[in-house]
Every structure is written in structure tokens, then in C-alpha cells.
Interface confidence: medium
């Protein structure tokens, strides 16, 4: 119980005091306050909210609260020239047009500045052509189309359903397939849970609802015009042609009412199998083009959005540490929303606000954490994690030397079934121990721990009696801290039952219907799940900032490294002949993992025994723990992804949201049977095994006795 030993501690000022100060009613009040108008990045409304949060954090008692601004590339629809899609007849007349906006929810009819649905960073264009339905537009969907069905998407407009993978990956795949435009839509199979009413009568997506979102492929670059460096006053900006990650073809999102009109006329090939059928009453024919009677009709896109360099504002609050002020524990979540942000991000921002208030209350009573806590309200997350990335680029030298941990705080809920945690293996034991001390908010688990309900509802696939904890991927503001800088990171939220709800995310994600009422009426009327998430996020920050010894267990990294090595080896072993031909061996990797395991075990033994009253030795041991995550960083980055530098984890090349283990080896092996030069391809596999083995061995040595 190391927290109670922190400096200036009185019996009152422990983790319990911090947790007891967190109140569901406050979170509810903050959520309401943050969701009454839109807070789109780059707008005056979001600047005003930044100043309000700055003022309130100061009132709560933080030592300093500053705004950090950057001028980054954002994207907006043209207010006088709206985006839409039409069906045109042989004379070029528009016989059907998609809707220009979502019908506003009750009570919000007179709200101004609701940005209509658009795909941020789409280039302008008015392509017309035949439609091809490409399912989810995943890598495997295009393999099915091109290789098995011999359907050529070149010069076609593709229509893809949202879900399964990040929308930017869908657009990248469509571009590579030669498409000249992309239509994204929400199918009820993915965004309508059976038996639940659509908003405002329930939490399902109505037919006119549309998911907004950026379609970039930044690969961790941040602002597309200033990759690697902050977008400050004296920044050198690339020309738009050299900008990182921008799509090259027009893209636009629609709802399922409009999708029905496009899909019901589709002809050409039948869907290859049932996994290509959604839940609209249409044949889900792949195309290309419309069926018999409608074969002369085409689809035309009208996209007029513009990219603009715009000022954004992060709010950075500091609570100075009493003993190790040069060690930073960071709690950050974004503030910008697509519209009202009822869930994304304000359910998270409201929790951060209450955590700041609780810490501030303790500080006013004379307490300080051992280490410095930084609180961040990030801007422009929705436009590519821009606020967090620019700040981290500006402060990278400090962060890589002083960063202990980063806890992310976007949406607190995506359901109300059980806890969901993604984090570095270093934090597994912290999360386990913390959740054992917290009460479960779940029905049927009264008087039981959060750990118990979580484990029951979301069991680990590998270890019985333990809950599932997932790998970190991307798509949120931890990316730069973890994937680029190698700072131990974690995230927690309440989620849905993935077994019974197969829809992607939550149905109203990034739509106008993501309101305060959605949360208050349907997801969490008592705000008990929000409170639990506040306790988890806040509790992690408290322990990370206050424990005498950092609450990291390096042995858990050893366990997963072995698991990941086994997994990548088994993928490679699908090609036994080639492994023999090209002398591909994983011995070096397994040897490095074995060494890591032994050294981590010895380090853990020393950690139990060392003299904690010796501040030099304590600092030395803590630094070895802090820098372990950093040791997995390869300064050269992954191939073609220089800002993804973590050798053990990276966002999947096929889905930014998902984490991939040993990503360098994985990508080298992916679809290797189709490579034109197998010798070169297997040579790259060998090189990636070498990089991984070296990195694991080098990381292990950072845990060895220093002399």
C-alpha cells in the first residue's frame, strides 16, 4: 500500500480520500455544461470552452493552467456549397440527392453551427461513375473483390459500410484499388441493435443519422503540414501536395435511408457470401453499376470541402510534485467534438474535470502528490490527434526524459455492460489491484468488486480468473506518447457486451444525436458508470503519481513477449518451405525473450529487497521501470511509418484502431505469398526478426544491475 507513504501525507490524504471526493452528480453537471452547443475544433465555441476549463482548473487549485496553441491543418464543409451525392440519369439530370444535414434532435432545432456530415480532409471533386459495393473496404474485402471475383474498382465510385476498421484505412484501400470516390454509410447491421428504438426514443441510429470523421492516414505524424515538429509561430509548412496522409479522392458519409436508395438498384455480381450482407432490404449486389432497368444511371459526388490552417488550443494544467517534480504523470483527453459530443469526448472530459476537482481539493488541504501530475484538455483530436501530437512534439525532450505514464481520457462510456481496459503490460498489475479495491456498479454485483464483475463479464482468453486487457492500438490521444515516445500508457472506459452486440462502436457515434440526453436517458441515468471510470482513471493517476515505487511489473511484459513471439512464429510457420529455403530463424527472438524473462524476474526480486529509504537507489530503480517502455523504441521507426517507433506494438497497418504485436515482422509477413520478389520479401522478414530480437535484448539489459 505504497500510496499512504507519500509525502505530506496525513491519514486523510490517501487514495480513499481522493476517490471519496469524486461525485457522480458533479460529472453529470459537467457533462451537461460541456454539451449544450457544438465544440468543433478551430471554432470560437471551442476556444471559449478552453478558456472556461482553464479558469475552472485554476479555481479547483492547480498550480498553473496554460493554453498551448498551434496552427494546424483542419477541414470544413463549404457553407454555401454543400456536399452531397446524386443518382443521375443518362441526360445528367439528378434524379436523387442525398440529404444535406441530419434532422436535428428534439430541443436542438434552433442550435446554430451544427456542422453537416462530412469526411474531414476529403479533397474537392465531382466524380461520376458506376458504383461498386466493397463491404467494409477492409484489405480482405478488396482481396475478395479483385482476386476471387475479378472485379476491378479502377475508375469506379465505391460504397463501403462503416465498421470493423478505421475509416481512413477504408479510404486508403479504395485509393490503392483505383477508385475515384468513396461513399461511407452506416448499415443497421452494424449500427442498430435489434430491439432498441432509434433516437430520440432509444440509443439506436435513425435512418437520417450520419457518422462524421477524418479520413487521414497520418501514421502518427500529427499536423499534416509539420510532421515531427510543432506547428508553432515560426513553423515551416509543407505545401499541400507534400502534406502527410491526405486522401487523394473525394469521400462522403451518408445514413442508411440514403444508402438504401443507392444500394437497392445495384446489379452486377451477387454478394460473395452472407458476411457481405447487411440488414437493409437490398440485394447487396457488388456491381459494378446498377441493374438492368437502371443501368444507364450513374452516381455523382459533389464535394466542396476546404482544408484550412486554423488555430487550436490545448489546456495544460500542472499539479507540482512534492518529491519528484521532474517526473510527469499525465492525464489527458480531448475537448473538441464533431457536434455536441455527448459521449465523444465530453463523457470523458467531464470525468477529467471531476478528477482535477478532487485532486485540487486535496491540494487545498495541504497535500501534494509525490510526482508532478499534468492534466490536458486536447484540441483537434477528431482531426487526427493534432492537439496532443503537436504538444508532445513541442515538449518531446522533456517527455522522453521525465514522462512516467500517460492515462487517456476520451469517452468514458461506449456501453454500460462492463469495464474495458487497454494498456501497456507494465500496468496490468496496477489495474488488477486497483479494480479489486473498487466497488462494481453493475446490477447483480452489489457489494462485489469491480474486478469480480469485470472478470465475470469479460474474462481473459488466456488466464482463468483474470479479466481481458487489450493491446493499445491508436485512434486516440495516447498515440504520440506510447507509439512515438515510449511512455507507458493506458486507457479505461465502460463498454458494451461484445458477444451480443456486434455493431461497431456505439450506434450514434459522431452523429448529431450524441447528446447529453442520450447519456442521461439511455446509457447512465445515475452516472454510476461514469463515476466508476473516474475512479479507475483517477485511481491509476493517483497511484502512478504517489507510489514510492512505481506500480509497474516488468514480469508481465516478459509473459506477453513470449506470447507475441509464439504468435508471430506460428504465422511464419504457415510457410515452412520458404523458411527453409531462405534460412529464416526465430531463435534470436526467442533467446532475447528468454533473457528478458530471466532478467525481469531478477529485477523484480531486487525491487522487493532494496532499501527504499535510500533516495538515490529508489530513484535508480524507478528510473529503470520508467525507462523500460522507452527501451522498446526504435529511433528509426517502422518501415514507411517513422512516427510509429515502438517495436512491440503499433497500430495495425490494416486498422488504425487495433494494436498489432511485433508489427515490423507482422507487416513483412503479411500477404508474402503474393510478393513478386520472394527473396527480397523473406530478407525483410529476417531483418525485422533481427530488429525485434535486438530491441527485446536491449530492453532486457536496461533492467540488469547497473554495475
Amino acid at each position: 500500500k505504497s500510496s499512504n507513504e507519500a509525502t505530506n501525507i496525513t491519514p486523510k490524504h490517501n487514495m480513499k480520500a481522493f476517490l471519496d471526493e469524486l461525485k457522480a452528480e458533479n460529472i453529470k453537471k459537467f457533462l451537461y455544461n460541456f454539451t449544450q452547443i457544438p465544440h468543433l475544433a478551430g471554432t470560437e465555441q471551442n476556444f471559449q470552452l478552453a478558456k472556461q476549463i482553464q479558469s475552472q482548473w485554476k479555481e479547483f487549485g492547480l498550480d498553473s493552467v496554460e493554453l498551448a496553441h498551434y496552427d494546424v491543418l483542419l477541414s470544413y464543409p463549404n457553407k454555401t456549397h454543400p456536399n452531397y451525392i446524386s443518382i443521375i440519369n443518362e441526360d445528367g439530370n439528378e434524379i436523387f440527392n442525398t440529404s444535406l444535414f441530419e434532422p436535428p434532435p428534439p430541443g436542438y432545432e434552433n442550435v446554430s453551427d451544427i456542422v453537416p456530415p462530412f469526411s474531414a480532409f476529403s479533397p474537392q471533386g465531382m466524380p461520376e461513375g458506376d458504383l461498386v459495393y466493397v463491404n467494409y473496404a477492409r484489405t480482405e474485402d478488396f482481396f475478395k473483390l479483385e482476386r476471387d471475383m475479378k472485379i476491378n474498382c479502377s475508375g469506379k465510385i465505391v460504397i463501403a459500410r462503416y465498421g470493423k476498421v478505421f475509416r481512413g484505412n477504408k479510404v486508403k484501400n479504395a485509393q490503392l484499388a483505383g477508385a475515384k470516390g468513396v461513399i461511407l454509410y452506416s448499415d443497421p447491421a452494424d449500427y442498430f441493435a435489434p430491439g432498441v428504438k432509434s433516437y430520440p426514443d432509444g440509443w439506436n441510429l435513425p435512418g437520417g443519422g450520419v457518422q462524421r470523421g477524418n479520413i487521414l492516414n497520418l501514421n502518427g505524424a500529427g499536423d499534416p503540414l509539420t510532421p515531427g515538429y510543432p506547428a508553432n509561430e515560426y513553423a515551416y509548412r509543407r505545401g499541400i501536395a507534400e502534406a502527410v496522409g491526405l486522401p487523394s479522392i473525394p469521400v462522403h458519409p451518408i445514413g442508411y435511408y440514403d444508402a438504401q436508395k443507392l444500394l437497392e438498384k445495384m446489379g452486377g455480381s451477387a454478394p460473395p457470401d452472407s458476411s457481405w450482407r447487411g440488414s437493409l432490404k437490398v440485394p447487396y449486389n457488388v456491381g459494378p453499376g446498377f441493374t438492368g432497368n437502371f443501368s444507364t444511371q450513374k452516381v455523382k459526388m459533389h464535394i466542396h470541402s476546404t482544408n484550412e490552417v486554423t488555430r487550436i488550443y490545448n489546456v495544460i494544467g500542472t499539479l507540482r510534485g512534492a518529491v519528484e517534480p521532474d517526473r510527469y504523470v499525465i492525464l489527458g483527453g480531448h475537448r473538441d467534438s464533431w457536434v455536441f459530443g455527448g459521449i465523444d469526448p465530453q463523457s470523458g472530459a467531464a470525468v477529467v474535470h471531476e478528477i482535477v476537482r478532487s485532486f485540487g481539493t486535496l491540494k487545498k488541504e495541504g497535500w501534494r502528490p509525490r510526482r508532478t501530475i499534468l492534466f490536458a484538455s486536447w484540441d483537434a483530436e477528431e482531426f487526427g490527434l493534432l492537439g496532443s501530437t503537436e504538444w508532445a512534439e513541442e515538449n518531446s525532450r522533456l517527455l522522453q526524459e521525465r514522462g512516467v505514464a500517460y492515462i487517456n481520457a476520451d469517452s468514458s462510456i461506449e456501453g454500460n455492460y462492463t469495464l474495458r481496459v487497454d494498456c501497456t503490460p507494465l500496468m496490468y498489475s496496477l489495474v488488477h489491484n486497483l479494480t479489486k479495491e473498487l466497488k462494481s456498479p453493475d446490477e447483480g454485483f452489489e457489494g462485489k468488486s469491480l474486478y469480480e464483475s469485470w472478470t465475470k463479464k469479460s474474462p481473459s482468453p488466456e488466464f482463468s480468473g483474470m479479466p481481458r486487457i487489450s493491446k493499445l492500438g491508436s485512434g486516440n490521444d495516447f498515440e504520440v506518447f506510447f507509439q512515438r515516445l515510449g511512455i507507458a500508457s493506458g486507457r479505461a472506459r465502460y463498454t458494451k457486451n461484445w458477444e451480443t452486440n456486434k455493431f461497431s462502436g456505439y450506434p450514434l457515434y459522431h452523429s448529431v444525436y450524441e447528446t447529453y440526453e442520450l447519456v442521461e436517458k439511455f446509457y447512465d441515468p445515475m452516472f454510476k458508470y461514469h463515476l466508476t471510470v473516474a475512479q479507475v482513471r483517477g485511481g491509476m493517476v493517483f497511484e502512478l503519481a504517489n507510489s514510492i515505487v512505481l506500480p509497474f511489473d516488468c514480469r508481465d511484459y516478459a509473459v506477453v513477449l513470449r506470447k507475441y513471439a509464439d504468435k508471430i512464429y506460428s504465422i511464419s510457420m504457415k510457410h515452412p518451405q520458404e523458411m527453409k529455403t531462405y534460412s529464416v530463424s526465430f531463435d534470436s527472438l526467442f533467446s532475447a525473450v528468454k533473457n528478458f524473462t530471466e532478467i525481469a524476474s531478477k529485477f523484480s526480486e531486487r525491487l522487493q529487497d532494496f532499501d527504499k529509504s535510500n533516495p538515490i537507489v529508489l530513484r535508480m530503480m524507478n528510473d529503470q521501470l520508467m525507462f523500460l517502455e522507452r527501451a522498446f523504441i526504435d529511433p528509426l521507426g517502422l518501415p514507411d511509418r517513422p512516427f510509429y517507433r515502438h517495436v512491440i506494438y503499433a497500430p495495425s497497418s490494416h486498422n488504425k484502431y487495433a494494436g498489432e504485436s511485433f508489427p515490423g515482422i507482422y507487416d513483412a509477413l503479411f500477404d508474402i505469398e503474393s510478393k513478386v520478389d520472394p527473396s527480397k520479401a523473406w530478407g525483410e522478414v529476417k531483418r525485422q526478426i533481427y530488429v525485434a530480437a535486438f530491441t527485446v535484448q536491449a530492453a532486457a539489459e536496461t533492467l540488469s544491475e547497473v554495475a
Epitope: 443497421p188 442498430f192 435489434p194 432509434s198 426514443d201 441510429l205 435512418g207
Partner: antibody
Framework: QVQLVQSGGGLVQPGGSLRLSCAAS????????MSWVRQAPGKGLEWVAN????????YYVDSVKGRFTISRDNAKNSLYLQMNSLRAEDTAVYYC?????????????????WGQGTMVTVSS | AIRMTQSPSSVSASVGDRVTITCRAS??????LAWYQQKPGKAPKLLIY???SLQSGVPSRFSGSGSGTDFTLTISSLKPEDFATYYC???????????FGGGTKVEIK
């Protein structure tokens, strides 16, 4: 509680008319498609007609088109079936039923609430 | 119009038996299928929707499966109250048309 209560059945001669009524309670009647389903003696179920929430769309099985009219009065929470030019083969128990749009707006997939049924006998 | 063919038209079974009823659509209907139970002199009762989703309050011994053209209703262990007639119904062509299968009577052996 949620229920549908029917009235208006009876014996009628071929060529005659009859009006069936269905009173809804316990739910927001105006939010649902509604239907009539019938069952001839000793036979299976046959869908007869559908009407949209606001009455703007109506659909009928081929065998009753031009003879039967489905209608609703949302202010009275009531559904109606006006049956004209009745034939012997129209003899059946008629059920009103709520169409549950469980999958997405107006997809109308299953009949989750049924009336108790009313017998219509067409005979000379 | 979509035709729904149920088989068998009747089945004799004992309490505790596993009973399987099939329904075939004349063309693909995705998962737009519901199953009903009807007892003599009573209105039908919804058991399964979306081919496999159990309606609230229906015992878990009832289950549905299938997609496209072939569907199955299974009663895992027959109870005395399960002796009735069962109907499938497609809604792929809603709202223009709805079709029921001919029914399967589950009788006491």
C-alpha cells in the same frame, strides 16, 4: 398494459360489407406500423394489410386489393379494416397486430402484439 | 412473391424430446425471419425475431438459426405447454408484402 382489443366481426352475406376495429392501449400507437392478419378455419396465417404510422402508405395482399381498406385514427388509438364485396373465401378469424420495427426505422419485421381475434363469416 | 415452405407439416414428439422445424424461403431473405407459436383458439405469440434473436419472456429452450433461404426453429427439450402450431414469417419484402409458412403442428406422441 400493452394490448389490442378488437370488435366488429360477425356473419355477413356474400357481397356485403363489414368494418373491423382495433383499439390500442399501453403504447404510443402513432409510432408503429399496424397490420391485419387472418386465419381461415383449420388453415394457416395470412397477412392481409399494412398501414404506416401516419397512414401515408398502405399495402394489401393481392386477393383483397380494391375490396378492403385499412385505415387508422391516431387521435383515437384505433385501427380499422373496412371490408366490402365480401366473398366466402374471406371467412376467417381476423387479427390486428402491431408491427415491431425491431431492426431499424420502419423495417417492420415481426408482429409482437396481437389482438384477441374476431370471427368473420361470409355465408348466405 | 416470396414463398415460405415449412417442414414437416406435423411432428409427433414426447416431453423432453428435441424438436427441429425448418423453413425455406423461395429467395434469399437475409435474416428477416420470425417464428410464432399458436395454440388453438388463441392469437399467435412471437418467439424469435431476426432469425435467431429470442423475444423477451420466451424460454431459452427455443432457439432459431439460419440466414438467406434456410432457417431452423429448435425446441431443445419439449415441455407440455409447447404442444402447438408453429409458423415462420418473412419480412424481407415489408411493407409491400409479408408471408407466413404453412405451419408445423407439434403433437403429443
Amino acid at each position: 398494459q400493452v394490448q389490442l382489443v378488437q370488435s366488429g366481426g360477425g356473419l355477413v352475406q356474400p357481397g356485403g360489407s363489414l368494418r373491423l376495429s382495433c383499439a390500442a392501449s399501453g403504447f404510443t400507437f402513432s409510432s408503429y406500423w399496424m397490420s391485419w392478419v387472418r386465419q381461415a378455419p383449420g388453415k394457416g396465417l395470412e397477412w392481409v394489410a399494412n398501414i404506416k404510422q401516419d397512414g401515408s402508405e398502405k399495402y394489401y395482399v393481392d386477393s383483397v386489393k380494391g375490396r378492403f381498406t385499412i385505415s387508422r385514427d391516431n387521435a383515437k388509438n384505433s385501427l380499422y379494416l373496412q371490408m366490402n364485396s365480401l366473398r366466402a373465401e374471406d371467412t376467417a378469424v381476423y387479427y390486428c397486430a402491431r408491427v415491431w420495427d425491431y431492426y431499424y426505422d420502419s423495417s417492420g419485421d415481426a408482429f409482437d402484439i396481437w389482438g384477441q381475434g374476431t370471427m368473420v363469416t361470409v355465408s348466405s | 412473391a416470396i414463398r415460405m415452405t415449412q417442414s414437416p407439416s406435423s411432428v409427433s414428439a414426447s416431453v423432453g424430446d428435441r424438436v427441429t422445424i425448418t423453413c425455406r424461403a423461395s429467395q434469399g431473405i437475409s435474416s428477416w425471419l420470425a417464428w410464432y407459436q399458436q395454440k388453438p383458439g388463441k392469437a399467435p405469440k412471437l418467439l424469435i425475431y431476426a432469425a435467431s434473436s429470442l423475444q423477451s419472456g420466451v424460454p431459452s429452450r427455443f432457439s432459431g438459426s439460419g440466414s438467406g433461404t434456410d432457417f431452423t426453429l429448435t425446441i431443445s427439450s419439449l415441455k407440455p405447454e409447447d404442444f402447438a402450431t408453429y409458423y415462420c414469417q418473412q419480412a424481407n419484402s415489408f411493407p409491400r408484402a409479408l408471408t407466413f409458412g404453412g405451419g408445423t403442428k407439434v403433437e403429443i406422441k
